[in-house]
Interface confidence: medium
């Protein structure tokens, strides 16, 4: 009674830095009983490892076994439906898995007033699980950079988008008081890498920001 | 002296699109901040969208919703705003303006930091 079961319909990896979740929808019909395995094969290492015998949800994160991802040639993912006695064909990931497909997102972003100037501080990606040599500038070490989107609440404009190539950047608000809230997106101008937007922050601008000069 | 000329007005259904030209003339086009304001009959000049001289900040009024893109081509001194899923209410003259100054700046969402106008092009949008 091998192969009764069907196989899960399709199997993909959602990673951000040091963040690999491997996903899969499930199989028509499944009952109570039904689980699903997953094995990994590193690309150089022709051999597929079980790395979980029996998950009961539709995810299963990767990070601990893939930490060498940056460093590597990439990866392949593979996950069969098990119920009992009986399991499913495998269903693989359709592309190798592989720095390219990290999405990029910042960690935070820091804002402060100076003379009318708002001043942006992109704070990277520190994942606990990442090793201590595998920051994401000396990952990405060259070619970073970021979209800026601001929004002024309440104001007539709502985006204004900068490409900034560097961790700071300062907007000139020119006497526009109220709020401002900025959002970043990461990229790297040498990678296909897709970014995330981060969280919006917010800072308020009043008149007591401004110093007059003569 | 900079001179500028808008094309590409017309008539146009609801959620039909256009594209918007302008053409500079005279100084140099390409150390200039410029955008595009719009005037609806019977109201003031209203801010729709702006680029900066190397095209890497774009500004946006915040009616817009994503449906305009601004662009411009440097080599030909021509400053665009490609139009998508108009309204009637986007219904007025199309005004392109370019200012002085490079720095990123809210002052390019104000009508008074722009030194050069063109004439304008009328947009309608109607059934």
């Known amino acids: 009674h091998g192969t009764e079961l069907p196989s899960p319909p399709s199997v993909w990896f959602e990673a951000e830095f040091f963040h690999h979740i491997l996903h899969w929808t499930p199989i028509p019909n499944q009952s109570e009983s039904t689980c699903y395995e997953v094995a990994l094969l590193r690309y150089g290492i022709e051999s597929w490892n079980s790395i979980s015998n029996c998950s009961q949800t539709l995810s299963y994160d990767l990070t601990a076994v893939t930490l060498d991802l940056y460093h590597s040639n990439g990866y392949r993912a593979r996950v069969r439906a098990v119920d009992g006695s009986r399991h499913s064909n495998w269903t693989v990931t359709n592309t190798r898995f592989s720095v390219d497909e990290v999405t990029l997102t910042v960690g935070s972003v820091n804002l402060e007033i100076h003379n009318g100037f708002i001043l942006g501080k992109i704070q990277l990606p520190r994942p606990k699980m990442a090793p201590a040599n595998d920051t994401y500038e000396s990952i990405f070490s060259h070619f970073r950079e970021y979209e800026i989107a601001i929004r002024k609440v309440p104001g007539n404009f709502t985006f204004t988008h900068k490409k900034v190539k560097h961790e700071n950047f300062s907007l000139l608000t020119s006497g526009e008081v109220g709020e401002f809230c900025v959002q970043v997106k990461p990229s790297v101008a040498s990678r296909s890498n897709k970014g995330m937007w981060s969280k919006e922050e917010c800072i308020s601008l009043t008149r007591q920001y401004f110093t007059v000069t003569n | 002296e900079l001179q500028l000329l808008e094309s590409g007005g017309g008539l146009v259904q609801p959620g039909g699109s256009l594209r918007l030209s302008c053409a500079a003339s005279?100084?140099?086009?390409?150390?200039?901040?410029v955008g595009w304001f719009r005037q609806a009959p019977g109201k003031g000049r209203e801010f729709v969208s702006a680029i900066t001289w190397n095209g890497d900040t774009t500004y946006f009024g915040d009616f817009v919703e994503g449906r305009f893109t601004i662009s411009r081509d440097n080599s030909k001194n021509t400053l665009y705003l490609q139009m998508n899923s108009l309204r009637a209410e986007d219904t007025a003259v199309y005004y392109c303006?370019?200012?002085?100054?490079?720095?990123?700046?809210?002052?390019?969402?104000?009508?008074?930091?722009?030194?050069?106008w063109g004439q304008g092009t009328l947009v309608t949008v109607s059934s």
């Open positions: 303006a370019a200012a002085t100054g490079q720095v990123w700046s809210l002052q390019y969402l104000r009508e008074s930091s722009y030194a050069y």
């Open positions: 005279g100084r140099t086009f390409s150390s200039h901040t």
